[in-house]
Each structure stands twice: as structure tokens, then as C-alpha cells.
């Protein structure tokens, strides 16, 4: 039995002393306006949709809507006694961008579209960001333009940051033991979570822990290995706190950012810094995905916050923390890329759309300049004597690059007889050629290596 605590006294006339769920009338499976509580606060009923009449005998408005009379006064007991009907109006009036790439006039319209979508057994529409899908919006009064309140930002976003744990099976007993952990962040109230693809590698069992300690088994919904983004889902009753995606394209070098993660149960780790470079060419950093840019930051990104959000001072996600790839330099996958991934993921699930293939060898690299070469030489005594080429930061396991014998710290100096000056040169050749005969400087040796790019889903 439910108590009626919290129900306002004027509405209590004719209501039972105690709520009895068994007495509630059966409800249809789908409600156009979403669900609401009846006047007594006892039963869940179908709420009236936006624009529908409310008050009097009309019943309550649906989720996120409020009953407003013609002069804009919210309906109350007094209004009801004067026998005036109101209209259901969305409590939120700003436009929002949905994961289906549509702009909705307000949050209520997006929720209505999401309910329609689910009724048709399509994926729900989730909020990607405040404001219209295509446009920028600069708010000069926002925190990010006025203050550096890191703790406020953390307090605001922490509830939507989750701890992700992976389990492996022991070889013979097949018992599951924890093997690794990372972070992620919630992007939809019904439990969609974004993290790094590398956090959920190899079909391990994935467990998610929320800030309140609740744990859930997660299903992997979609993965983009190259972009290193994964979408996982937990089944949670009730609404979860979510983070909205900002526009990474609007980031300015020098802007404060906060990297947050949840490396341990019930605990967050926070690092802060500035944006060093806003659109560091993925072609340079090398790439799982040659046409992707990264955000470079001096905020420390490590195993603890990998997969978690990199946020601006408004608490909007402007990137996913990805691992630190070399001392003093950390990278994040930009939110614009996450939006693209979420929109395409929504599309794929809705339409089962075919995917065009891309060529891939499996390295992260960066263009070597004389200053970068000097910096690396100072750090590593055995760094090769070269001042240009493509410097390999990481060789991804089980890829053509690894099979061919490429190694971290190699410098690619030529491919198929053509000299390589930058990481772009490598990306261009990968697109064109089916076999790559590379000359690689390793230490002070030149080594011949053959790599056969593979075609993979983008």
C-alpha cells in the first residue's frame, strides 16, 4: 500500500485515506502524453498530451507538462473551483536536438516522438543537446564564460558518471573474475551509456555501477572500434540523470575542461586542465579513423577516467576521455563525433542500414616535426635520428599493423617507394593501396615491413 504523503490538501477531497494499487484502473500499454499520477496521487494514469485540455474533469497533464489557464496562470484548486479549463503546456520551452537528428520545439515534443518511436518498436529518441541540431548558441552569462567553479561542475555531472567493470572467465573453471574497469556517462534517461570501445573490448561481461551504488548488467548496443566509442545499455526502472553533449567545434584553446571518471565504486576521480588544441588531426594521431579529429588537453587522462566525460564549465560533454598516449599529452574524442555516432547508431537500429567499408591498419600516429622529434629525443635517448615522418604512438592489438610487425615508437619514413613526411601521407596511402611496403626507422635501423590494410565497418 502507498501512503498519500506529499499530496496537496485541496486535491484530497474524495480521495481514500490510503492508496490501494489494486483499485487502480488498468492502463493502456502506450500513453500519447506519457504517464502521470491521478488527482489523489494514488494511481498512474495516462496524462493529457501537450495542447490538450486539463483541469476540471479532464485529468492531469502528462510527464513534463503543466496545466496553464489562458492568462498563463498555472492551474490550481482555485482555478478548478472557478470551473475554468486549462491547457497542457511544456514546462521546458527551449528547443532540443534528438538522436534522430531532428530539432524539437521542446523536451515534451521529443518525449512524445520517443514514445511514438518505441510504440513502433524503434529505438527511443534521446536528447543530444540543448538547442537546435545544427546551430551554435553562445551564452555570455554562462558559468564557462564567467567563472572557474570546477567543484560546481563536478557536483552537477557526477550523478551521470558511471563505473564500468569487465569480467573475464578463468580458463578451466570458467568462473568470472573482475579483469578491468573504466568509466562511462549516461546519455538517456532509460539507461544508454557512452564509453570508450576499448573499455568494453573482447566480449567481456560488462557490469555498470551508478553513483548511488546500484549495479546492473549492461548490454553492448553499438561499437565503433576506430573512433573508440561504444554505446551500452542498462535496464533501469525510473529516470536516470543524463549529460548533454556540447559542441566541440565551438571549443577554444585555453578553455577550462574537467575530466571526470569513476574508477572505483561510489567514487569519482577529477582532473582539470585546459584545451591545448581543439581539433588535433586524427590523421596525425593515427588513427583508428583517419578522418577524425581529437581534442588535446593537459587534463590528466588515465585508466581511472578513461571512457568518462570531458566537460566544459557548463557541465556539457565536449569529449570522451581516451587514454593518455604519450607523457604530458592526453586526448579526448570530440562530442561532435559522439553525436554523429549516436545519430548513426539510432539510424542503424531503426533501419538496419548497410555500412560502407573503410580501410584500416590499426595504428595511432602523429606527424613528426623537428620540434616534436627534439622533444621525443629528450624523453627517449634511443629515439631515431629523424625529423619528419609518421611517429607511431600505439599499435592496436589484432590489427594488420601488429601482424605486419609495426611497433610503438617506430617512425614510418616511406611507403611503396614514396617518402612519408606526415601522418596524412600514411592515411592517404592507406585509402589508395591494398599493400603497404613500408620502410620504418626503429632505433637507428631501417626495417622493411609489409602491412595489408583490412576493410572494416566505419
Amino acid at each position: 500500500q502507498l501512503s498519500r504523503a506529499g499530496r496537496s490538501a485541496p486535491l484530497a477531497a474524495g480521495c481514500p485515506d490510503r492508496c490501494e494499487p489494486a483499485r487502480c484502473p488498468p492502463q493502456p500499454e502506450h500513453c500519447e502524453g506519457g504517464r502521470a499520477r491521478d488527482a489523489c496521487g494514488c494511481c498512474e494514469v495516462c496524462g493529457a498530451p501537450e495542447g490538450a485540455a486539463c483541469g476540471l474533469q479532464e485529468g492531469p497533464c502528462g510527464e513534463g507538462l503543466q496545466c496553464v489557464v489562458p492568462f498563463g496562470v498555472p492551474a490550481s484548486a482555485t482555478v478548478r473551483r472557478r470551473a475554468q479549463a486549462g491547457l497542457c503546456v511544456c514546462a521546458s520551452s527551449e528547443p532540443v536536438c534528438g538522436s534522430d537528428a531532428n530539432t524539437y520545439a521542446n523536451l515534451c515534443q521529443l518525449r512524445a516522438a520517443s514514445r511514438r518511436s518505441e510504440r513502433l518498436h524503434r529505438p527511443p529518441v534521446i536528447v543530444l543537446q540543448r538547442g537546435a541540431c545544427g546551430q551554435g548558441q553562445e551564452d555570455p552569462n554562462s558559468l564557462r564564460h564567467k567563472y572557474n567553479f570546477i567543484a560546481d561542475v563536478v557536483e552537477k555531472i557526477a550523478p551521470a558518471v558511471v563505473h564500468i567493470e569487465l569480467f573475464r572467465k578463468l580458463p578451466f573453471s570458467k568462473r568470472e573474475v573482475p579483469v578491468a574497469s573504466g568509466s562511462g556517462f549516461i546519455v538517456s534517461e532509460d539507461g544508454l551509456i557512452v564509453t570508450n570501445a576499448h573499455v568494453v573490448t573482447n566480449k567481456h561481461r560488462v557490469k555498470v555501477e551508478l553513483k548511488n551504488g546500484a549495479t546492473y548488467e549492461a548490454k553492448i548496443k553499438d561499437v565503433d572500434e576506430k573512433a573508440d566509442i561504444a554505446l551500452i545499455k542498462i535496464d533501469h526502472q525510473g529516470k536516470l540523470p543524463v549529460l548533454l553533449l556540447g559542441r566541440s567545434s565551438e571549443l577554444r584553446p585555453g578553455e577550462f575542461v574537467v575530466a571526470i571518471g569513476s574508477p572505483f565504486s561510489l567514487q569519482n576521480t577529477v582532473t582539470t586542465g585546459i584545451v591545448s588544441t581543439t581539433q588535433r588531426g586524427g590523421k596525425e594521431l593515427g588513427l583508428r579513423n583517419s578522418d577524425m579529429d581529437y581534442i588535446q588537453t593537459d587534463a590528466i587522462i588515465n585508466y581511472g577516467n578513461s571512457g568518462g566525460p570531458l566537460v566544459n564549465l557548463d557541465g556539457e560533454v565536449i569529449g570522451i576521455n581516451t587514454l593518455k598516449v604519450t607523457a604530458g599529452i592526453s586526448f579526448a574524442i570530440p562530442s561532435d563525433k559522439i553525436k554523429k555516432f549516436l545519430t548513426e547508431s539510432h539510424d542503424r537500429q531503426a533501419k538496419g542500414k548497410a555500412i560502407t567499408k573503410k580501410k584500416y591498419i590499426g595504428i595511432r600516429m602523429m606527424s613528426l616535426t623537428s620540434s616534436k622529434a627534439k622533444e621525443l629525443k629528450d624523453r627517449h635517448r634511443d629515439f631515431p635520428d629523424v625529423i619528419s615522418g609518421a611517429y607511431i604512438i600505439e599499435v592496436i592489438p589484432d590489427t594488420p599493423a601488429e601482424a605486419g610487425g609495426l611497433k610503438e615508437n617506430d617512425v614510418i619514413i616511406s611507403i611503396n617507394g614514396q617518402s612519408v613526411v606526415s601522418a596524412n601521407d600514411v592515411s592517404d596511402v592507406i585509402k589508395r593501396e591494398s599493400t603497404l611496403n613500408m620502410v620504418v626507422r626503429r632505433g637507428n635501423e631501417d626495417i622493411m615491413i609489409t602491412v595489408i590494410p583490412e576493410e572494416i565497418d566505419p
Epitope: R168, F172, E402
Partner: antibody
Framework: QVQLVQSGAEVKKPGASVKVSCKAS????????MHWVRQAPGQRLEWMGA????????AYNQKFKGRVTITADKSASTAYMELSSLRSEDTAVYYC????????????????WGQGTLVTVSS | DIQMTQSPSSLSASVGDRVTITCSVS?????MYWYQQKPGKAPKLLIY???NLASGVPSRFSGSGSGTDFTFTISSLQPEDIATYYC????????FGQGTKLEIK
């Protein structure tokens, strides 16, 4: 740091049994299987079997089935390997070794080894 | 059972030489592992998942291959590399190659 320390050398008569111990430290004993591998003089390494210390579940090489028993004492973080009905060809160095796991590739291997225990079977 | 054939069974090389050991298996495996064993000592893991260097292992050691044929290489032989090297696979259960004894000329 991870350490596996084995019991000392043994000399046994044919038909007898031997029990070798392996004390683990520096990691959570129940998070990894413990395996036993032997090496007869001039021979290749030979896997004998394994135990999950948490559950006591075991797996054995068919070649030794019925003669080898692997056990573990969680509270003492110690694994044991007992080989019965000894014969001269069981003369070998017996190693305990921890199962390692590659997070990236999902492969298994042996990452830490005990110092070895020489068991000599002679009449 | 998977049969493993490691070759050569012994080899002699000079300091600075490039040394290559091969391991063939009777049916395809996902990964190969390589160990170094010095006289009177336990084996030590050098290479995991075919080509990944184990922690603290010098970069002169490397591994490659796939399916049924795998290779272990020392790019420039050092005196301390004198040992016996074993390959190992782990499909249904672990098995080892017969070993390659490496000596200095």
C-alpha cells in the same frame, strides 16, 4: 610483487606419492587459476593440471588423470600437487605457475612461476 | 591434441646476430607465447598474444605469425640471451614446443 615459493626437493621410491606445495603472495590468490607444469631432464615442459582456488574446481591432463591431485588452501594462499604411484620417469622438476591473462587479446599464458621442486624417483 | 614442432632444436650464433626460431602447430591457434629458460631456473614469459612484449622484456625480442606458423626473433643477440626458448599454445589445454637451445659461437 607476485611471488610463488615452492617446497624443497624430494627423493621418493617407485610406487610412493609426493606432495609439493606452492605458496602465493603479492596478488589476490582466488582471482587466478594455479597450474602445475613439469620438466623431465632434457624434455619439454608438460602441463599437468590446474585449480581454481576459490571453488576448488580442477582440470587435469589426461596423461596424469587418476595419479595427480591438485588442491588449494585459500586461507594459506597455498596450492598443492600430489602425484601418486611414482615411477622413475616421473623424475622431473615440478613448477607451479600462475595463469596470466591478456586483456587486449583475451589469451591465456603463464606469467609467474615458482622456483621449481626437483622430485627424484629412485629405488 | 595439438602437436607443436619447434625448430631448430639448437643453434649457435654470434653476438649481434639476428636469430630466428619457428614454431608450427598441427591446427590453427589464436595466439602463440614464447618463454626463455636459463639453466636451473624457471621459464620466463617473453612474448604474449603472438607479438606483444611482456613487461620488462628488451625490445630486441619480437614475435610474429598467425594460424599454424609462428616466429620468434632476437634482432641483435646479446651474451645474456643464452638460454633455451620454448613456444606455447593454449587451445583446449596448454602445450609447449620441445625447445630451442641457443648458444654463442
Amino acid at each position: 610483487q607476485v611471488q610463488l615459493v615452492q617446497s624443497g626437493a624430494e627423493v621418493k621410491k617407485p610406487g610412493a606419492s609426493v606432495k609439493v606445495s606452492c605458496k602465493a603472495s603479492g596478488y589476490t590468490f582466488t582471482d587466478y587459476e594455479m597450474h602445475w607444469v613439469r620438466q623431465a631432464p632434457g624434455q619439454r615442459l608438460e602441463w599437468m593440471g590446474a585449480i581454481d582456488p576459490e571453488t576448488g574446481g580442477t582440470a587435469y591432463n589426461q596423461k596424469f588423470k587418476g595419479r595427480v591431485t591438485i588442491t588449494a588452501d585459500k586461507s594459506a594462499s597455498t596450492a598443492y600437487m600430489e602425484l601418486s604411484s611414482l615411477r622413475s620417469e616421473d623424475t622431473a622438476v615440478y613448477y607451479c605457475t600462475r595463469e596470466g591473462y591478456s586483456y587486449e587479446g583475451g589469451g591465456y599464458y603463464f606469467d609467474y612461476w615458482g622456483q621449481g621442486t626437483l622430485v627424484t624417483v629412485s629405488s | 591434441d595439438i602437436q607443436m614442432t619447434q625448430s631448430p632444436s639448437s643453434l649457435s650464433a654470434s653476438v649481434g646476430d639476428r636469430v630466428t626460431i619457428t614454431c608450427s602447430v598441427s591446427s590453427s591457434v589464436s595466439y602463440m607465447y614464447w618463454y626463455q629458460q636459463k639453466p636451473g631456473k624457471a621459464p620466463k614469459l617473453l612474448i604474449y598474444d603472438t607479438s606483444n612484449l611482456a613487461s620488462g622484456v628488451p625490445s630486441r625480442f619480437s614475435g610474429s605469425g598467425s594460424g599454424t606458423d609462428f616466429t620468434f626473433t632476437i634482432s641483435s643477440l646479446q651474451p645474456e640471451d643464452i638460454a633455451t626458448y620454448y613456444c606455447q599454445q593454449w587451445s583446449s589445454y596448454p602445450t609447449f614446443g620441445q625447445g630451442t637451445k641457443l648458444e654463442i659461437k
